[in-house]
């Protein structure tokens, strides 16, 4: 099929001992193959720092994933989500403020 | 690997405002985060923020979250710097800098503007 | 804020001969990511700094092979094997693991 590319979403959860935990979506892609990384000041977290969610079917023939990192509150500016699917990239940075969901969709 | 061309010296009275521009070619400007530096005459180097020109997301050393203001416009490929109540502990040359990422690797600042000279003065 | 605190302040040498200049930093410098982000430049009178090493031991491109970076921790190291004119400068280490990034306050190489 069609390079597909992916509906991307950043999200963050409540606060716990001053850390928040972002995560990043992607979905409705296709091919499968994607990276899906968090990076500080533009340099990538290493693995240890990150969860990822396995690359899953969604139903409509394309899929979905998410990676996710714990981060202290105040610094979310300094972390963005980066994505390369079929040649094709992307930096998605956290929502600031009261404002907690960011979605892009990738042309 | 690019360039950037900063703008032309400042002579500007205490208290007035600043605003530095570097502009660049040659790269992916929106792919890239750049950072800006302060050195004083016969002093070493510090660094005072970077903005990633994709979103305009920025990170302030704190000694100059209020003094300085970071801002891109992707249409001309150019980075601002406005620095505002300035003092003579202000007037030094002041440099954007590219920084060269690519994963876990990479260096800070990479490739740099000619610098700016900014003099404080009444 | 991580303070780097370089030695000497002055390094007169011949040309030709090896240059080893010190950088210390005041805590580890090891990122989140595993990786140490300890960086060179070089800058000569009147212009720009330029980038030397990265990641404490990896030259830039276009840098040539007589200058060499290694350390860990807190303690790093610049070798100039065979100091030529154009060597002549300011050097300074950088920190890019800990926000805020800094410099240390420079070694000038000299001729003797």
């Known amino acids: 099929g069609s390079t597909v590319p992916p509906m991307v979403n950043v999200t963050c959860s409540e606060v716990s001992e001053g850390n928040i935990t972002v995560t990043c979506r992607a979905s409705s892609f296709y091919p499968r193959n994607i990276t899906l990384t968090w990076r500080q000041d533009g340099v990538s977290l290493s693995h240890n720092t990150q969860q990822w969610g396995d690359v899953l079917p969604d139903g409509n023939g394309t899929y979905q994933t998410w990676v996710a990192t714990r981060i202290r509150q105040g610094e979310e500016q300094r972390f963005t989500c980066y994505m390369e699917h079929s040649g094709n990239h992307g930096t998605h940075p956290v929502p600031s403020g009261n404002s907690h969901h960011h979605h892009h969709h990738h042309h | 690997q690019g360039q950037m061309q900063q703008s032309g010296a400042e002579l500007v009275k205490p208290g007035a405002s600043v605003k530095l521009s570097c502009k660049t070619s040659g790269f992916t400007f929106s792919d890239n985060y750049i950072s800006w530096l302060k050195q004083k005459p016969g002093q070493s180097l510090e660094w005072i923020a970077w903005?990633?020109?994709?979103?305009?997301?920025?990170s302030y050393n704190q000694k100059f979250t209020a003094k300085a203001q970071l801002t891109v416009d992707t249409s001309s490929s150019t980075a601002y710097m406005q620095f505002s109540s300035l003092t003579t502990e202000d007037s030094a040359i002041y440099y954007c800098?590219?920084?060269?990422?690519?994963?876990?690797?990479?260096?800070?600042?990479?490739?740099w503007g000619q610098g700016t000279l900014v003099t404080v003065s009444a | 804020d991580v303070l780097m605190t370089q030695t000497p302040l002055s390094l007169p040498v011949s040309l030709g001969d090896q240059a080893s200049l010190s950088c210390r930093s005041s805590?580890?410098?090891?990122?989140?990511?595993?990786?140490?982000?300890l960086e060179w430049y070089l800058q000569k009178p009147g212009q720009s700094p330029k980038l030397l090493i990265y990641k404490v031991s990896n030259r830039f491109s276009g840098v040539p092979d007589r200058f060499s970076g290694s350390g860990s921790g807190t303690d790093f190291t610049l070798k100039i094997s065979r100091v030529e004119a154009e060597d002549l400068g300011v050097y300074y280490c950088f920190q890019g693991s800990h926000v805020p990034w800094t410099f240390g306050g420079g070694t000038k190489v000299e001729i003797k």
């Open positions: 805590q580890n410098i090891v990122h989140i990511n595993g990786n140490t982000y």
């Open positions: 903005i990633y020109a994709g979103t305009g997301g920025t």
């Open positions: 800098a590219r920084h060269d990422y690519y994963g876990t690797s990479g260096a800070w600042f990479a490739y």
